[in-house]
């Protein structure tokens, strides 16, 4: 007897059966079944994404494709070789033995066959073709990573080589720094005992100028003094030749007239036979209290009393009203003789005002009244000036009719502000005037445009602030 | 520092009009007064416009009332003179100047020349057909 089946096995494989008599001959088959769904991420017959979503995904799943491909080539071969070698000698015995019908049933198992080998085939060229495409991909993808690692290498060197280059460059500085800390420490060291020993120096030469300045008036003092003794016995002497040569002459006593030692202002000194400008001792009219006042013995025909002076900026002329009062400063350098002391001298006697300027461009000039003096304190040592000459303006620089004396802290000006705080200095301010001979002490170059400097506005008009400057009085009768 | 800068002279017809500039630095126009002031050859230097307390107080001498205004913009810190109707006798050198705002005489309201103490370089202007 003779019969054809087709089945399923467990494991879900078509299976054709062919009963021939005791002979039973069994087919398995690949299906297309067995194959994965086109719903897996690697379908068998789909087209491939554009690229993969990570190479070694990739890597594997062309791994796998070829298991596959290598599989289903080795069942081929395996196939045809049975074909080849069982098939033959059954296919005789098939041919001798069976009937007509059963070549009916041996030529559907060969279509079938065919229709799968050839299904198959058609399956494998596409896994081929997606394995190419892959394939292809991948070494594209491979030689653009290939590039991109080639030029982060470049980069990672040149970026090494520059870190090693500044590594290099900043050890140098550290250690360039280090030189310096330790050369600047060393020099610091050095500067400070440097310091140390010019401040005990600068404080020893202090004091001996000191004592120089003391021993210099005092020699000052004796020289006019043995000047004028000098004088005096010279006229002793002459008077005395002069009786002893008189043939009528009677024996009579030189009375010598008292020695004068103290003296009022600079033009008594000058008088008194000492000529030479210098710091001389001035006493108080009517009273034993002394100052120290600078003599100009040279301008004008000399005899002048300097009661102030600017020439450097080493004084500071922003004081108190006490200290305009009773004077500051050196008279061998900048100072302000004191107001008191002006205000009793010129209250006495008629006494005239010269005050000098130097401008910064080598420039002098002068203004002279005929009559100046101070009122007393209660008034403010207010000012008075009269009869103006000289080269340094046609009109006053000092308001007129005269101001109130005004100091940081005691406001006499006219002025809606307080002129000696805005201005700087003590002065006779009016709202706030065209001059301050006591404003602030400006160099050369930042001399101009200046609001609080020494100022003398009809000689070098408003802003400019002057190199130097000497207000000096005279009597009117000298 | 103190700086002022004018600009914007020239030269113009009779009837005409310019506007000057005065840019100053080193000070705030809060705390200061600005004048405006002229210099014709062979002349004294003379007031022209004064300006205080931002705008606030305004001075014209009698030779320019009527023709000139003088305004100032102090986040600028420029104070500005537009002159009108110019006449051949405003010809000189122009020249802005500053003062300390509170330089002022009890019961007064304008200030010496001699007060002010910050001055330009001048401008130009020239009046001429």
């Known amino acids: 007897y003779s019969n054809f089946r087709k089945s399923v096995d467990s494991t879900g494989r078509r299976q054709y059966q062919v009963q021939n008599g005791p002979c039973s001959y069994t087919f398995l088959l690949p299906e297309t079944d067995s194959c994965r769904s086109s719903s897996s991420p690697y379908m068998s017959n789909a087209v491939q994404r554009d690229a993969p979503l990570d190479y070694d995904d990739s890597v594997q799943r062309l791994q796998v494709l070829e298991n596959i491909l290598e599989n289903n080539t080795q069942w081929l071969m395996k196939l045809e070789n049975y074909i080849q070698d069982n098939m033959k000698k059954e296919m005789v015995e098939i041919q001798q033995n069976v009937v007509q019908n059963q070549t009916a049933v041996m030529i559907e198992i060969g279509t079938s066959l065919l229709n799968q080998t050839a299904a198959q085939t058609r399956k494998l060229t596409d896994v081929e073709a997606q394995v190419l495409n892959q394939t292809t991909r991948l070494e594209l993808q491979l030689l653009q990573h290939s590039i991109s690692t080639n030029k982060l290498e470049k980069q990672i060197l040149d970026q090494t080589s520059e870190i090693n280059k500044l590594q290099n460059k900043n050890s140098f500085l550290e250690q360039k720094v280090l030189d310096m800390e330790g050369k600047h420490s060393e020099q610091l060291q050095s500067m400070k005992e440097q310091k140390d020993e010019l401040q005990v120096l600068v404080s020893k030469q202090s004091s001996v100028i000191d004592e120089l300045e003391k021993k210099l008036v005092t020699a000052t003092v004796n020289n006019s003094l043995l000047q004028k003794q000098q004088h005096d016995l010279m006229e002793t002497v002459n008077s005395l030749l002069t009786m002893m040569s008189s043939p009528n002459s009677k024996s009579s006593v030189a009375i010598r007239k008292e020695e004068q030692t103290t003296f009022r202002d600079c033009a008594e000194i000058f008088k008194s036979g000492l000529t030479t400008s210098g710091i001389y001792t001035l006493t108080f009219p009517n009273s034993t209290e002394e100052i120290k006042a600078y003599c100009d013995m040279d301008v004008g025909g000399g005899g002048w009393t300097v009661i102030q002076h600017r020439e450097d900026g080493s004084v500071d002329f922003q004081r108190t009203w006490k200290e305009y009062k009773e004077g500051f400063g050196s008279p061998l350098g900048e100072y302000w003789l004191g107001n008191e002391f002006v205000s009793q001298l010129t209250g006495q006697h008629r006494y005239v005002l010269k005050i000098q300027l130097k401008d910064w461009e080598g420039n002098e000039a002068h203004s002279l009244y005929d009559h100046f003096y101070l009122a007393g304190e209660e008034s403010n040592y207010r000012i008075h000036l009269t009869g103006l000459t000289g080269t340094a303006g046609k009109i006053s620089s000092i308001s007129q009719p005269g101001s109130d004396f005004s100091t940081k802290d005691s406001d006499n000006d006219k002025c809606i502000c307080k002129c000696s705080q805005m201005l700087s200095g003590g002065w006779w301010f009016d709202a706030c005037g065209p001059s301050n001979l006591n404003g602030q002490y400006y160099p050369q170059k930042q001399n101009t445009n200046k609001f609080n400097g020494i100022k003398w506005y009809y000689w070098k008009g408003s802003g400019y602030s002057l190199k130097a400057t000497t207000m000096m009085i005279r009597p009117a009768d000298f | 520092e103190v700086q002022l800068v004018e600009s914007g002279g020239g030269l113009v017809q009779p009837g005409g009009s310019l506007r000057l500039s005065c840019a100053a630095s080193?000070?705030?126009?809060?705390?200061?007064?600005i004048g405006w002031f002229r210099q014709a050859p062979g002349k004294e230097r003379e007031g022209v416009s004064s300006?205080?307390?931002?705008?606030?107080?305004?001075y014209y001498a009698d030779s320019v009332k009527g023709r000139f205004t003088i305004s100032s913009d102090n986040s600028k810190n420029t104070v500005y003179l537009q002159m009108n109707s110019l006449r051949p006798e405003d010809t000189a050198v122009y020249y802005c100047?500053?003062?300390?705002?509170?330089?002022?005489?009890?019961?007064?309201?304008?200030?010496?020349?001699?007060?002010?103490?910050?001055w330009g370089q001048g401008t130009l202007v020239t009046v001429s057909s």
């Open positions: 300006i205080r307390d931002n705008g606030g107080s305004t």
């Open positions: 080193g000070i705030t126009l809060d705390d200061y007064a």
């Open positions: 100047a500053a003062v300390p705002a509170g330089r002022l005489r009890y019961g007064e309201q304008w200030y010496p020349i001699y007060e002010y103490d910050a």
